[in-house]
Protein backbone atom coordinates (compact mmCIF):
# COMPACT_ATOMS: atom_id res chain seq x y z
CA UNK A 1 0.00 0.00 0.00
CA UNK A 2 1.07 3.40 -0.62
CA UNK A 3 2.57 5.62 2.11
CA UNK A 4 -0.33 8.19 3.19
CA UNK A 5 1.67 10.80 3.59
CA UNK A 6 3.06 10.60 -0.47
CA UNK A 7 0.95 11.47 -3.65
CA UNK A 8 0.60 7.94 -5.66
CA UNK A 9 2.88 7.98 -8.90
CA UNK A 10 0.40 9.64 -11.16
CA UNK A 11 -1.69 11.74 -9.02
CA UNK A 12 -0.48 15.08 -8.50
CA UNK A 13 -3.21 17.79 -9.08
CA UNK A 14 -1.92 19.81 -12.33
CA UNK A 15 -4.51 22.12 -12.21
CA UNK A 16 -8.04 22.43 -9.51
CA UNK A 17 -10.44 20.46 -11.23
CA UNK A 18 -13.37 18.11 -11.10
CA UNK A 19 -11.12 15.10 -11.10
CA UNK A 20 -10.09 15.67 -7.51
CA UNK A 21 -13.92 14.98 -5.85
CA UNK A 22 -12.34 11.53 -6.78
CA UNK A 23 -9.33 11.60 -4.48
CA UNK A 24 -9.45 10.27 -1.21
CA UNK A 25 -9.07 12.36 1.85
CA UNK A 26 -5.33 11.77 2.08
CA UNK A 27 -4.69 11.83 -1.59
CA UNK A 28 -6.19 15.50 -1.63
CA UNK A 29 -3.67 16.08 1.27
CA UNK A 30 -1.23 14.57 -0.52
CA UNK A 31 -1.43 15.87 -4.21
CA UNK A 32 -2.83 18.83 -4.03
CA UNK A 33 -0.19 22.26 -4.00
CA UNK A 34 -1.11 25.02 -1.44
CA UNK A 35 0.40 27.43 -3.99
CA UNK A 36 -1.38 25.81 -6.98
CA UNK A 37 -4.61 26.18 -4.77
CA UNK A 38 -4.21 29.66 -3.61
CA UNK A 39 -4.13 30.79 -7.56
CA UNK A 40 -6.73 28.69 -8.30
CA UNK A 41 -9.10 29.65 -5.67
CA UNK A 42 -11.73 30.70 -8.21
CA UNK A 43 -12.82 27.32 -9.18
CA UNK A 44 -12.94 25.60 -6.39
CA UNK A 45 -16.96 26.91 -6.27
CA UNK A 46 -17.38 25.68 -9.70
CA UNK A 47 -16.46 22.05 -8.73
CA UNK A 48 -18.67 20.03 -6.64
CA UNK A 49 -16.29 19.10 -3.41
CA UNK A 50 -17.85 17.85 0.33
CA UNK A 51 -17.56 20.06 2.74
CA UNK A 52 -15.32 17.29 4.06
CA UNK A 53 -13.27 17.84 1.01
CA UNK A 54 -13.45 21.41 1.77
CA UNK A 55 -11.63 21.07 5.13
CA UNK A 56 -9.09 19.32 3.46
CA UNK A 57 -8.18 22.35 0.71
CA UNK A 58 -8.95 24.89 3.83
CA UNK A 59 -5.75 23.06 5.74
CA UNK A 60 -3.72 23.57 2.28
CA UNK A 61 -4.12 27.14 2.78
CA UNK A 62 -3.27 27.41 6.38
CA UNK A 63 -0.10 26.03 5.88
CA UNK A 64 0.67 28.26 2.78
CA UNK A 65 -0.93 31.34 4.70
CA UNK A 66 0.07 30.96 8.96
CA UNK A 67 -0.20 34.31 9.38
CA UNK A 68 -3.74 34.61 7.53
CA UNK A 69 -4.95 34.44 4.04
CA UNK A 70 -4.75 37.41 1.94
CA UNK A 71 -7.49 39.38 0.08
CA UNK A 72 -7.29 37.60 -3.18
CA UNK A 73 -7.73 34.40 -1.66
CA UNK A 74 -10.27 35.43 0.77
CA UNK A 75 -12.77 36.99 -2.15
CA UNK A 76 -12.57 33.28 -3.27
CA UNK A 77 -13.52 31.28 -0.62
CA UNK A 78 -17.17 30.54 -1.21
CA UNK A 79 -18.28 28.05 0.95
CA UNK A 80 -15.03 27.39 2.06
CA UNK A 81 -15.99 29.86 4.89
CA UNK A 82 -17.73 27.69 6.28
CA UNK A 83 -14.93 26.09 7.61
CA UNK A 84 -13.16 29.05 8.88
CA UNK A 85 -12.92 29.44 12.73
CA UNK A 86 -13.40 32.63 14.58
CA UNK A 87 -9.53 32.68 15.34
CA UNK A 88 -8.31 32.23 11.63
CA UNK A 89 -11.10 35.22 10.70
CA UNK A 90 -9.22 37.47 13.48
CA UNK A 91 -5.79 37.43 11.32
CA UNK A 92 -7.55 38.52 8.50
CA UNK A 93 -7.52 42.94 7.01
CA UNK A 94 -10.92 42.41 4.88
CA UNK A 95 -11.53 45.81 3.05
CA UNK A 96 -13.41 45.46 0.30
CA UNK A 97 -17.27 45.74 0.66
CA UNK A 98 -18.13 43.23 -2.16
CA UNK A 99 -15.53 40.28 -0.75
CA UNK A 100 -17.64 41.04 2.62
CA UNK A 101 -21.31 40.45 0.72
CA UNK A 102 -19.44 37.00 -1.14
CA UNK A 103 -19.05 35.99 2.25
CA UNK A 104 -22.25 36.57 4.22
CA UNK A 105 -24.24 35.21 0.81
CA UNK A 106 -22.28 32.10 1.74
CA UNK A 107 -23.93 32.04 5.24
CA UNK A 108 -27.42 33.12 4.09
CA UNK A 109 -30.86 31.33 5.46
CA UNK A 110 -28.55 30.17 8.22
CA UNK A 111 -28.05 32.56 11.88
CA UNK A 112 -25.38 34.93 12.49
CA UNK A 113 -22.27 32.24 13.37
CA UNK A 114 -19.85 33.50 15.64
CA UNK A 115 -17.53 33.23 12.31
CA UNK A 116 -19.67 35.73 10.43
CA UNK A 117 -19.86 38.19 13.63
CA UNK A 118 -16.52 37.95 13.83
CA UNK A 119 -15.72 38.96 10.18
CA UNK A 120 -18.19 41.96 10.61
CA UNK A 121 -16.29 43.13 13.55
CA UNK A 122 -12.96 42.73 11.62
CA UNK A 123 -14.49 44.28 8.86
CA UNK A 124 -15.81 47.38 10.97
CA UNK A 125 -13.00 47.97 12.58
CA UNK A 126 -11.09 48.13 9.74
CA UNK A 127 -13.41 50.73 8.17
CA UNK A 128 -13.42 52.76 11.45
CA UNK A 129 -16.88 53.15 11.59
CA UNK A 130 -20.12 51.73 10.79
CA UNK A 131 -21.13 53.77 7.23
CA UNK A 132 -24.58 53.61 5.26
CA UNK A 133 -23.36 51.22 2.40
CA UNK A 134 -21.51 48.87 5.48
CA UNK A 135 -25.03 49.24 7.34
CA UNK A 136 -27.16 48.89 3.96
CA UNK A 137 -24.94 45.18 3.61
CA UNK A 138 -25.17 43.68 6.65
CA UNK A 139 -29.00 45.17 7.40
CA UNK A 140 -30.05 43.30 4.17
CA UNK A 141 -28.70 40.10 5.17
CA UNK A 142 -28.92 40.05 9.27
CA UNK A 143 -32.09 42.42 9.82
CA UNK A 144 -31.03 42.08 13.03
CA UNK A 145 -27.76 43.26 13.06
CA UNK A 146 -28.18 46.69 14.25
CA UNK A 147 -29.52 45.58 17.66
CA UNK A 148 -27.22 43.10 18.38
CA UNK A 149 -24.48 45.88 18.85
CA UNK A 150 -23.68 47.46 21.68
CA UNK A 151 -24.89 50.87 22.87
CA UNK A 152 -21.20 51.93 22.71
CA UNK A 153 -20.77 50.22 19.15
CA UNK A 154 -23.91 52.02 18.17
CA UNK A 155 -22.22 55.21 19.12
CA UNK A 156 -19.71 54.84 15.91
CA UNK A 157 -22.86 54.57 13.50
CA UNK A 158 -22.91 57.73 11.95
CA UNK A 159 -26.11 59.69 11.10
CA UNK A 160 -25.81 59.94 7.75
CA UNK A 161 -25.90 55.97 7.74
CA UNK A 162 -29.18 55.88 9.22
CA UNK A 163 -31.28 56.16 6.15
CA UNK A 164 -30.35 52.80 5.52
CA UNK A 165 -32.29 51.55 8.39
CA UNK A 166 -35.33 49.70 7.74
CA UNK A 167 -38.23 49.20 10.39
CA UNK A 168 -37.82 45.53 10.98
CA UNK A 169 -34.18 46.18 11.56
CA UNK A 170 -34.28 47.96 14.74
CA UNK A 171 -37.72 45.24 16.17
CA UNK A 172 -35.23 43.28 18.70
CA UNK A 173 -33.26 46.87 19.42
CA UNK A 174 -34.08 47.89 23.94
CA UNK A 175 -34.28 51.11 25.11
CA UNK A 176 -30.57 51.58 25.58
CA UNK A 177 -29.59 51.22 22.03
CA UNK A 178 -32.37 53.12 20.74
CA UNK A 179 -31.78 56.15 23.31
CA UNK A 180 -28.28 56.01 20.96
CA UNK A 181 -30.05 55.72 17.72
CA UNK A 182 -32.85 58.62 17.98
CA UNK A 183 -31.08 61.44 17.98
CA UNK A 184 -28.67 60.33 15.37
CA UNK A 185 -31.91 59.61 13.13
CA UNK A 186 -33.08 63.02 14.83
CA UNK A 187 -30.50 64.35 13.05
CA UNK A 188 -30.53 62.45 10.07
CA UNK A 189 -34.45 63.09 9.37
CA UNK A 190 -34.17 67.00 10.12
CA UNK A 191 -34.64 68.66 6.85
CA UNK A 192 -37.88 66.50 6.43
CA UNK A 193 -40.92 68.06 6.23
CA UNK A 194 -43.81 66.83 9.38
CA UNK A 195 -45.61 63.82 7.55
CA UNK A 196 -42.45 62.55 5.79
CA UNK A 197 -40.05 62.97 9.12
CA UNK A 198 -42.58 61.04 11.37
CA UNK A 199 -42.64 58.13 8.89
CA UNK A 200 -38.99 57.96 9.20
CA UNK A 201 -38.61 58.87 12.87
CA UNK A 202 -41.31 56.49 14.15
CA UNK A 203 -39.33 53.52 14.36
CA UNK A 204 -36.45 55.02 16.95
CA UNK A 205 -39.10 56.86 18.75
CA UNK A 206 -38.46 54.22 21.57
CA UNK A 207 -35.47 56.59 22.23
CA UNK A 208 -37.15 60.04 22.20
CA UNK A 209 -37.87 62.09 25.12
CA UNK A 210 -40.06 64.34 26.49
CA UNK A 211 -39.93 66.89 25.00
CA UNK A 212 -39.96 65.81 21.40
CA UNK A 213 -42.86 64.12 22.16
CA UNK A 214 -44.61 67.39 23.10
CA UNK A 215 -43.33 68.98 19.77
CA UNK A 216 -44.69 65.81 17.89
CA UNK A 217 -48.42 66.08 19.75
CA UNK A 218 -48.39 70.05 18.05
CA UNK A 219 -47.98 68.28 14.30
CA UNK A 220 -51.36 65.75 13.93
CA UNK A 221 -49.08 62.91 13.40
CA UNK A 222 -51.66 59.80 14.60
CA UNK A 223 -48.76 58.04 16.44
CA UNK A 224 -50.26 53.75 16.69
CA UNK A 225 -50.21 52.41 19.71
CA UNK A 226 -47.88 49.88 19.03
CA UNK A 227 -45.38 52.81 18.55
CA UNK A 228 -46.91 54.73 22.02
CA UNK A 229 -45.86 51.06 23.72
CA UNK A 230 -42.61 51.57 23.32
CA UNK A 231 -42.09 54.64 24.02
CA UNK A 232 -39.76 55.06 27.27
CA UNK A 233 -42.13 55.10 30.37
CA UNK A 234 -39.89 58.25 31.84
CA UNK A 235 -40.87 60.36 28.69
CA UNK A 236 -44.49 59.33 28.68
CA UNK A 237 -45.13 60.26 32.17
CA UNK A 238 -44.36 64.26 32.27
CA UNK A 239 -47.52 64.02 28.99
CA UNK A 240 -50.74 65.36 29.78
CA UNK A 241 -54.01 63.75 28.67
CA UNK A 242 -54.79 66.58 25.92
CA UNK A 243 -50.90 66.26 24.53
CA UNK A 244 -51.16 62.58 24.24
CA UNK A 245 -55.00 62.91 22.79
CA UNK A 246 -53.14 64.99 20.22
CA UNK A 247 -50.08 62.47 19.73
CA UNK A 248 -52.35 59.25 19.49
CA UNK A 249 -55.56 61.37 17.21
CA UNK A 250 -57.96 58.89 16.66
CA UNK A 251 -56.15 55.87 17.64
CA UNK A 252 -56.37 57.13 21.82
CA UNK A 253 -59.48 54.89 21.59
CA UNK A 254 -56.39 51.78 22.00
CA UNK A 255 -55.36 53.13 25.38
CA UNK A 256 -58.12 51.59 26.99
CA UNK A 257 -56.69 47.76 25.78
CA UNK A 258 -53.52 48.81 27.16
CA UNK A 259 -54.63 50.48 30.52
CA UNK A 260 -52.76 47.40 32.68
CA UNK A 261 -49.59 47.84 30.36
CA UNK A 262 -46.71 50.32 30.54
CA UNK A 263 -46.33 52.99 29.83
CA UNK A 264 -50.11 53.47 29.80
CA UNK A 265 -50.04 52.16 33.43
CA UNK A 266 -48.15 54.49 34.80
CA UNK A 267 -49.25 57.53 32.66
CA UNK A 268 -52.70 57.32 34.07
CA UNK A 269 -51.49 57.00 37.29
CA UNK A 270 -49.82 60.12 37.14
CA UNK A 271 -52.78 61.68 35.40
CA UNK A 272 -56.00 63.40 37.46
CA UNK A 273 -59.36 61.61 37.03
CA UNK A 274 -60.96 64.60 35.89
CA UNK A 275 -58.74 65.08 32.94
CA UNK A 276 -58.57 61.39 31.76
CA UNK A 277 -62.84 61.57 32.32
CA UNK A 278 -62.63 63.81 29.35
CA UNK A 279 -61.10 61.07 26.51
CA UNK A 280 -64.01 58.94 27.64
CA UNK A 281 -62.79 55.79 27.57
CA UNK A 282 -63.36 54.51 30.95
CA UNK A 283 -59.60 54.98 32.23
CA UNK A 284 -59.35 54.75 35.73
CA UNK A 285 -56.83 54.49 38.31
CA UNK A 286 -56.15 58.64 37.80
CA UNK A 287 -55.59 61.29 40.91
CA UNK A 288 -58.63 61.63 42.78
CA UNK A 289 -60.31 64.82 42.58
CA UNK A 290 -59.23 67.56 45.28
CA UNK A 291 -55.93 65.84 45.73
CA UNK A 292 -52.50 67.62 45.89
CA UNK A 293 -49.61 66.00 43.12
CA UNK A 294 -46.27 67.15 44.63
CA UNK A 295 -43.35 66.13 42.08
CA UNK A 296 -41.04 65.08 44.47
CA UNK A 297 -38.13 64.62 41.80
CA UNK A 298 -38.41 68.19 41.17
CA UNK A 299 -38.25 69.10 44.50
CA UNK A 300 -34.27 66.65 44.73
CA UNK A 301 -33.67 68.25 41.48
CA UNK A 302 -33.97 71.70 43.34
CA UNK A 303 -32.45 71.11 46.60
CA UNK B 1 -35.83 26.39 11.31
CA UNK B 2 -35.54 25.15 7.54
CA UNK B 3 -38.35 22.89 6.54
CA UNK B 4 -38.48 20.49 3.19
CA UNK B 5 -42.03 19.44 2.16
CA UNK B 6 -41.41 16.32 -0.89
CA UNK B 7 -44.78 16.52 -3.25
CA UNK B 8 -45.22 14.65 -6.73
CA UNK B 9 -47.38 11.50 -8.35
CA UNK B 10 -47.50 8.68 -6.03
CA UNK B 11 -48.16 6.10 -8.83
CA UNK B 12 -46.35 5.86 -12.04
CA UNK B 13 -46.43 4.04 -15.07
CA UNK B 14 -43.50 1.39 -15.94
CA UNK B 15 -41.19 3.36 -18.46
CA UNK B 16 -42.49 6.76 -17.45
CA UNK B 17 -40.55 9.38 -15.61
CA UNK B 18 -40.90 9.71 -12.15
CA UNK B 19 -40.96 14.17 -11.11
CA UNK B 20 -40.71 15.00 -7.79
CA UNK B 21 -40.12 18.61 -6.30
CA UNK B 22 -38.56 19.42 -2.86
CA UNK B 23 -39.90 22.54 -1.15
CA UNK B 24 -37.53 25.13 1.08
CA UNK B 25 -39.34 26.63 3.73
CA UNK B 26 -37.96 28.98 6.69
CA UNK B 27 -34.61 29.38 4.81
CA UNK B 28 -32.84 30.14 1.53
CA UNK B 29 -32.20 27.16 -1.22
CA UNK B 30 -28.34 28.89 -1.01
CA UNK B 31 -27.13 26.29 0.75
CA UNK B 32 -24.01 24.73 -0.27
CA UNK B 33 -26.02 22.00 -1.79
CA UNK B 34 -28.61 19.99 -1.04
CA UNK B 35 -29.66 16.09 -1.99
CA UNK B 36 -32.43 13.06 -3.20
CA UNK B 37 -31.96 10.18 -0.65
CA UNK B 38 -34.57 6.95 -1.41
CA UNK B 39 -35.27 3.50 0.02
CA UNK B 40 -36.89 0.89 -1.15
CA UNK B 41 -39.80 -0.43 1.13
CA UNK B 42 -38.09 -2.73 4.01
CA UNK B 43 -34.47 -1.63 2.69
CA UNK B 44 -32.07 0.34 3.13
CA UNK B 45 -31.32 4.32 2.33
CA UNK B 46 -29.68 5.54 -1.50
CA UNK B 47 -28.26 8.37 -2.68
CA UNK B 48 -29.63 9.53 -5.51
CA UNK B 49 -27.67 13.10 -6.63
CA UNK B 50 -27.06 16.47 -5.03
CA UNK B 51 -27.41 19.71 -6.25
CA UNK B 52 -24.96 22.52 -5.60
CA UNK B 53 -26.10 26.68 -4.96
CA UNK B 54 -24.89 27.53 -8.43
CA UNK B 55 -26.63 24.62 -10.47
CA UNK B 56 -23.78 22.24 -10.06
CA UNK B 57 -25.35 18.40 -10.12
CA UNK B 58 -23.47 15.23 -9.23
CA UNK B 59 -25.51 11.90 -9.13
CA UNK B 60 -25.25 7.92 -8.01
CA UNK B 61 -22.84 6.59 -10.74
CA UNK B 62 -25.82 3.51 -10.74
CA UNK B 63 -28.66 6.34 -11.82
CA UNK B 64 -26.89 8.80 -13.34
CA UNK B 65 -28.24 7.79 -16.78
CA UNK B 66 -31.78 8.56 -15.91
CA UNK B 67 -31.53 11.19 -13.06
CA UNK B 68 -31.92 15.04 -13.63
CA UNK B 69 -31.85 17.02 -10.72
CA UNK B 70 -32.38 21.01 -10.92
CA UNK B 71 -33.08 24.02 -8.90
CA UNK B 72 -35.25 27.29 -9.09
CA UNK B 73 -34.42 29.78 -6.97
CA UNK B 74 -37.02 31.91 -7.17
CA UNK B 75 -39.64 28.81 -5.82
CA UNK B 76 -37.37 27.82 -2.97
CA UNK B 77 -37.73 24.57 -4.77
CA UNK B 78 -35.51 21.72 -6.28
CA UNK B 79 -36.23 18.55 -8.27
CA UNK B 80 -36.19 15.31 -9.66
CA UNK B 81 -36.88 13.83 -12.02
CA UNK B 82 -35.69 9.49 -13.08
CA UNK B 83 -36.76 8.29 -16.66
CA UNK B 84 -37.75 4.92 -17.73
CA UNK B 85 -38.88 3.77 -14.57
CA UNK B 86 -39.64 0.18 -13.36
CA UNK B 87 -41.03 -1.70 -10.18
CA UNK B 88 -37.26 -1.65 -8.81
CA UNK B 89 -38.00 2.10 -8.48
CA UNK B 90 -40.80 1.91 -6.00
CA UNK B 91 -39.53 3.66 -3.00
CA UNK B 92 -40.29 6.77 -0.28
CA UNK B 93 -38.33 9.50 -1.77
CA UNK B 94 -36.42 11.92 0.67
CA UNK B 95 -35.15 15.25 0.01
CA UNK B 96 -32.02 16.28 2.49
CA UNK B 97 -29.76 18.78 3.32
CA UNK B 98 -26.80 18.77 5.65
CA UNK B 99 -25.90 20.43 8.55
CA UNK B 100 -23.99 23.92 8.21
CA UNK B 101 -20.83 22.71 7.34
CA UNK B 102 -20.90 19.04 7.49
CA UNK B 103 -21.68 16.22 5.27
CA UNK B 104 -24.33 14.80 7.31
CA UNK B 105 -27.91 15.24 6.55
CA UNK B 106 -29.56 17.17 9.55
CA UNK B 107 -32.72 17.86 7.90
CA UNK B 108 -34.65 15.74 6.34
CA UNK B 109 -38.48 16.08 4.11
CA UNK B 110 -40.81 13.56 6.19
CA UNK B 111 -41.01 11.69 2.55
CA UNK B 112 -43.24 10.49 -0.43
CA UNK B 113 -44.11 7.29 -1.43
CA UNK B 114 -43.77 6.78 -5.05
CA UNK B 115 -45.26 3.31 -6.73
CA UNK B 116 -44.41 2.17 -10.06
CA UNK B 117 -46.87 -0.21 -11.12
CA UNK B 118 -49.37 -0.13 -14.60
CA UNK C 1 -25.50 -5.11 -1.82
CA UNK C 2 -24.90 -1.86 0.40
CA UNK C 3 -21.23 -0.33 0.17
CA UNK C 4 -20.96 -0.30 3.44
CA UNK C 5 -21.73 -3.48 5.89
CA UNK C 6 -23.56 -3.91 9.14
CA UNK C 7 -25.10 -6.17 11.04
CA UNK C 8 -29.23 -6.78 9.81
CA UNK C 9 -30.08 -6.98 13.36
CA UNK C 10 -29.10 -6.91 17.10
CA UNK C 11 -30.59 -6.82 20.55
CA UNK C 12 -30.19 -5.99 24.67
CA UNK C 13 -32.34 -6.02 27.24
CA UNK C 14 -33.07 -2.78 28.67
CA UNK C 15 -30.10 -0.65 30.64
CA UNK C 16 -27.44 -2.75 28.14
CA UNK C 17 -25.09 -1.63 26.09
CA UNK C 18 -24.91 -2.30 22.34
CA UNK C 19 -22.68 -2.22 19.51
CA UNK C 20 -23.54 -1.13 16.15
CA UNK C 21 -20.86 -2.10 13.27
CA UNK C 22 -20.42 -0.49 9.87
CA UNK C 23 -17.56 -1.38 7.72
CA UNK C 24 -16.35 0.18 4.46
CA UNK C 25 -12.95 -0.24 1.99
CA UNK C 26 -10.13 1.77 1.05
CA UNK C 27 -12.34 4.05 -1.00
CA UNK C 28 -15.09 5.39 2.26
CA UNK C 29 -13.92 5.23 5.53
CA UNK C 30 -10.27 3.76 4.56
CA UNK C 31 -9.68 6.59 2.38
CA UNK C 32 -10.53 9.00 5.66
CA UNK C 33 -13.96 10.06 5.24
CA UNK C 34 -15.92 10.53 8.34
CA UNK C 35 -18.98 8.24 9.18
CA UNK C 36 -22.37 9.84 10.02
CA UNK C 37 -25.25 7.44 12.26
CA UNK C 38 -28.91 7.97 11.54
CA UNK C 39 -32.07 6.55 13.85
CA UNK C 40 -34.65 5.56 11.71
CA UNK C 41 -38.42 5.17 13.71
CA UNK C 42 -40.78 3.07 11.88
CA UNK C 43 -42.92 5.41 9.32
CA UNK C 44 -40.54 8.33 9.90
CA UNK C 45 -37.61 10.02 8.07
CA UNK C 46 -34.07 9.44 9.55
CA UNK C 47 -32.48 11.41 12.13
CA UNK C 48 -29.27 12.39 12.33
CA UNK C 49 -27.65 10.98 15.63
CA UNK C 50 -23.53 11.05 15.18
CA UNK C 51 -21.83 13.38 12.44
CA UNK C 52 -17.91 13.34 12.01
CA UNK C 53 -17.47 9.94 13.27
CA UNK C 54 -18.43 10.66 17.53
CA UNK C 55 -20.03 14.41 17.56
CA UNK C 56 -23.65 14.48 19.09
CA UNK C 57 -26.17 16.98 17.42
CA UNK C 58 -27.74 19.07 20.41
CA UNK C 59 -30.91 16.92 21.66
CA UNK C 60 -29.34 13.76 21.01
CA UNK C 61 -28.86 12.08 24.47
CA UNK C 62 -24.94 10.98 25.81
CA UNK C 63 -26.12 7.24 25.85
CA UNK C 64 -24.82 7.56 21.94
CA UNK C 65 -21.83 7.32 21.02
CA UNK C 66 -19.28 6.63 17.47
CA UNK C 67 -16.04 5.97 17.44
CA UNK C 68 -13.50 5.10 13.55
CA UNK C 69 -10.97 3.09 12.79
CA UNK C 70 -9.18 2.38 9.84
CA UNK C 71 -12.46 0.83 7.61
CA UNK C 72 -14.56 0.87 9.55
CA UNK C 73 -16.88 1.95 12.64
CA UNK C 74 -19.35 1.83 15.16
CA UNK C 75 -22.43 3.21 17.02
CA UNK C 76 -22.47 2.56 20.67
CA UNK C 77 -25.45 2.38 22.60
CA UNK C 78 -25.44 2.87 26.87
CA UNK C 79 -28.44 2.17 29.04
CA UNK C 80 -30.53 0.76 26.39
CA UNK C 81 -34.15 1.62 26.63
CA UNK C 82 -37.65 0.87 24.43
CA UNK C 83 -37.21 4.16 22.73
CA UNK C 84 -34.45 3.16 20.99
CA UNK C 85 -35.80 0.72 19.30
CA UNK C 86 -35.43 1.24 15.64
CA UNK C 87 -33.33 1.19 12.48
CA UNK C 88 -29.39 2.40 12.68
CA UNK C 89 -27.66 3.31 9.26
CA UNK C 90 -23.99 5.02 8.95
CA UNK C 91 -22.78 6.45 6.05
CA UNK C 92 -19.71 7.89 4.45
CA UNK C 93 -18.21 9.25 1.50
CA UNK C 94 -16.85 6.91 -1.34
CA UNK C 95 -14.06 8.38 -3.47
CA UNK C 96 -14.59 6.30 -6.32
CA UNK C 97 -18.56 7.22 -6.81
CA UNK C 98 -17.81 10.76 -5.37
CA UNK C 99 -21.31 10.39 -3.60
CA UNK C 100 -22.31 9.54 -0.47
CA UNK C 101 -22.89 5.42 0.27
CA UNK C 102 -24.93 4.11 3.33
CA UNK C 103 -24.90 0.73 5.45
CA UNK C 104 -27.78 -1.55 4.96
CA UNK C 105 -29.17 -0.43 8.14
CA UNK C 106 -29.34 -2.51 11.38
CA UNK C 107 -32.61 -3.19 13.26
CA UNK C 108 -32.02 -2.53 17.13
CA UNK C 109 -34.85 -4.64 18.93
CA UNK C 110 -35.15 -4.11 22.92
CA UNK C 111 -36.17 -7.48 24.62
Known amino acids: EVEKTACPSGKKAREIDESLIFYKKWELEACVDAALLATQMDRVNAIPFTYEQLDVLKHKLDELYPQGYPESVIQHLGYLFLKMSPEDIRKWNVTSLETLKALLEVNKGHEMSPQVATLIDRFVKGRGQLDKDTLDTLTAFYPGYLCSLSPEELSSVPPSSIWAVRPQDLDTCDPRQLDVLYPKARLAFQNMNGSEYFVKIQSFLGGAPTEDLKALSQQNVSMDLATFMKLRTDAVLPLTVAEVQKLLGPHVEGLKAEERHRPVRDWILRQRQDDLDTLGLGLQGGIPNGYLVLDLSMQEALS | QVQLQESGPGLVKPSETLSLTCTVS????????WNWIRQPPGKGLEWIGR???????YYNPSLKSRVTISGDTSKNQFSLKLSSVTAADTAVYYC????????????WGQGTMVTVSS | QSVLTQPPSVSGAPGQRVTISCTGS?????????VHWYQQLPGTAPKLLIY???NRPSGVPDRFSGSKSGTSASLAITGLQAEDEADYYCQSYDSSLSGWVFGGGTKLTVL
Open chain 3, 52 to 54: GNS
Open chain 2, 96 to 107: ARPKLGIDAFDI
Open chain 2, 51 to 57: IYYNGNT
Open chain 3, 26 to 34: SSNIGAGYD
Open chain 2, 26 to 33: GGSISSYY
